[in-house]
Amino acid sequence: VPRWRQQWSGPGTTKRFPETVLARCVKYTEIHPEMRHVDCQSVWDAFKGAFISKHPCNITEEDYQPLMKLGTQTVPCNKILLWSRIKDLAHQFTQVQRDMFTLEDTLLGYLADDLTWCGEFNTSKINYQSCPDWRKDCSNNPVSVFWKTVSRRFAEAACDVVHVMLNGSRSKIFDKNSTFGSVEVHNLQPEKVQTLEAWVIHGGREDSRDLCQDPTIKELESIISKRNIQFSCKNIYRPDKFLQCVKNPEDSSCTSEI
């Protein structure tokens, strides 16, 4: 008798998920000497252990602790770039500005970036058909809990001046329901973080509005100030300039030193 399978509203696990995670791990540890000690098979086993045989709506941060432990990584705490709704540009930026780091520039973020995964209760199978959607099904799903966990840890590690890149083309430039707004903002440590500096990226090249006056930015400023962290906001008007150096990373003026 064929076993009944739960149909979720979200897309299923990314095809070749185990192979992709393992391959990414190997590639990352080859490129980053400080992570060469990492055993990628153990990383995959810990990743798998976090969600396999578990109900995909009952995942906890605790489930990911073995993976967190294996993926422990020290990034310069004063060189952290957070982002919200503008991932590609943030990644272009850190590809050039090599001394700054997004979450996806760390091992754990790199492993999971753009991937979906989930299992099934009481079976060792990976569900490639469907996975829970955060809104329509449940928030405690494997993907959401993973990102909440790593995002919290990343924010907790930050110090000095922390930058966040925000999308000035969106109706809500700062969205308190985003991972940045719901997790990272609340886990910056006031005793370590002096300032949060927001970079509001303008879309149109003729745009000369001051988006730092946007009501959602004022809301962000209020949240941050209440946490005893200074807030700064800058309008960034020429995002096409980021590509200057992506195309020519060898250009000496594309480093942090000018």
């Epitope: 930026f93 090249r205 745009d207 309008n235 300039k241 195309k247």
Partner: antibody, heavy 120, light 107 residues
Framework: QVQLVESGGGLVQPGGSLRLSCAAS????????MNWVRQAPGKGLEWVSA????????SYADSVKGRFTISRDNSKNTLYLQMNSLRAEDTAVYYC?????????????WGQGTLVTVSS | DIELTQPPSVSVAPGQTARISCSGD??????VYWYQQKPGQAPVLVIY???KRPSGIPERFSGSNSGNTATLTISGTQAEDEADYYC??????????FGGGTKLTVL
């Protein structure tokens, strides 16, 4: 090292035309916004025009809009400023300046300038 | 368009601290740049992004930007610092503006 060398300045009558050139070397020219900035004798700096990496975006100060045209030839590593309908108030040293990278919009490098004198 | 206002002149004794201000509406929302220009020479970038110093610029040059005012500070001013100083910002589109300039005199 980065070098910017302007040429093409000189004496021209009001209503006349002049074409300035800026030869760039020491960096990947096609990767940067380029600008013209001018300075009238004894006065401050005034931004004139900017052009994006591949020339698809151009902007001008109101004072020169409709009279000046900025362009670039990335194969020749050269920036140009075509100046038409020149007026006495256009008399200035014209500098070619290279933009800063990434989130910054200021001028990392400047040429030595070329003097344009508009007089009858 | 934002307008940047600088004092026409600032005087300082050698070894003392010189402060040059640059004011404009909500200037804190924009990165500010400072240039030094000596007679007959092209301007030189001394501060970018409010407070960053390009390589080769002495540590005595520093910058800040809060509220409506950006400030260039030269601590332990030397005779060779005598020059004109210009602030600059960019507020999008065709709005790249310079302040009127400040003549720094080292007494």
């Amino acid at each position: 090292q980065v070098q910017l060398v302007e040429s093409g300045g000189g004496l021209v009558q009001p209503g006349g035309s002049l074409r300035l050139s800026c030869a760039a070397s020491g960096f990947t020219f096609s990767s940067y916004y380029m600008n013209w900035v001018r300075q009238a004798p004894g006065k401050g700096l005034e931004w004139v025009s900017a052009i994006s990496m591949n020339g698809d975006y151009i902007s001008y100060a109101d004072s020169v809009k409709g009279r000046f045209t900025i362009s670039r030839d990335n194969s020749k590593n050269t920036l140009y400023l075509q100046m038409n309908s020149l007026r006495a108030e256009d008399t200035a040293v014209y500098y070619c300046a290279r933009d800063l990278p990434l989130v910054y919009t200021g001028f990392a490098y400047w040429g030595q300038g070329t003097l344009v004198t508009v007089s009858s | 368009d934002i307008e940047l206002t600088q004092p026409p002149s600032v005087s300082v004794a050698p070894g003392q601290t010189a402060r040059i201000s640059c004011s404009g509406d909500n200037l804190r929302h924009y990165y500010v740049y400072w240039y030094q220009q000596k007679p007959g020479q092209a301007p030189v970038l001394v501060i970018y992004g409010d407070s960053k110093r390009p390589s080769g610029i002495p540590e005595r040059f520093s910058g800040s930007n809060s509220g409506n005012t950006a400030t260039l500070t030269i601590s332990g001013t030397q005779a060779e610092d005598e020059a004109d100083y210009y602030c600059q910002t960019y507020t999008g589109g065709a709005s790249l503006v310079f302040g009127g300039g400040t003549k720094l005199t080292v007494l």
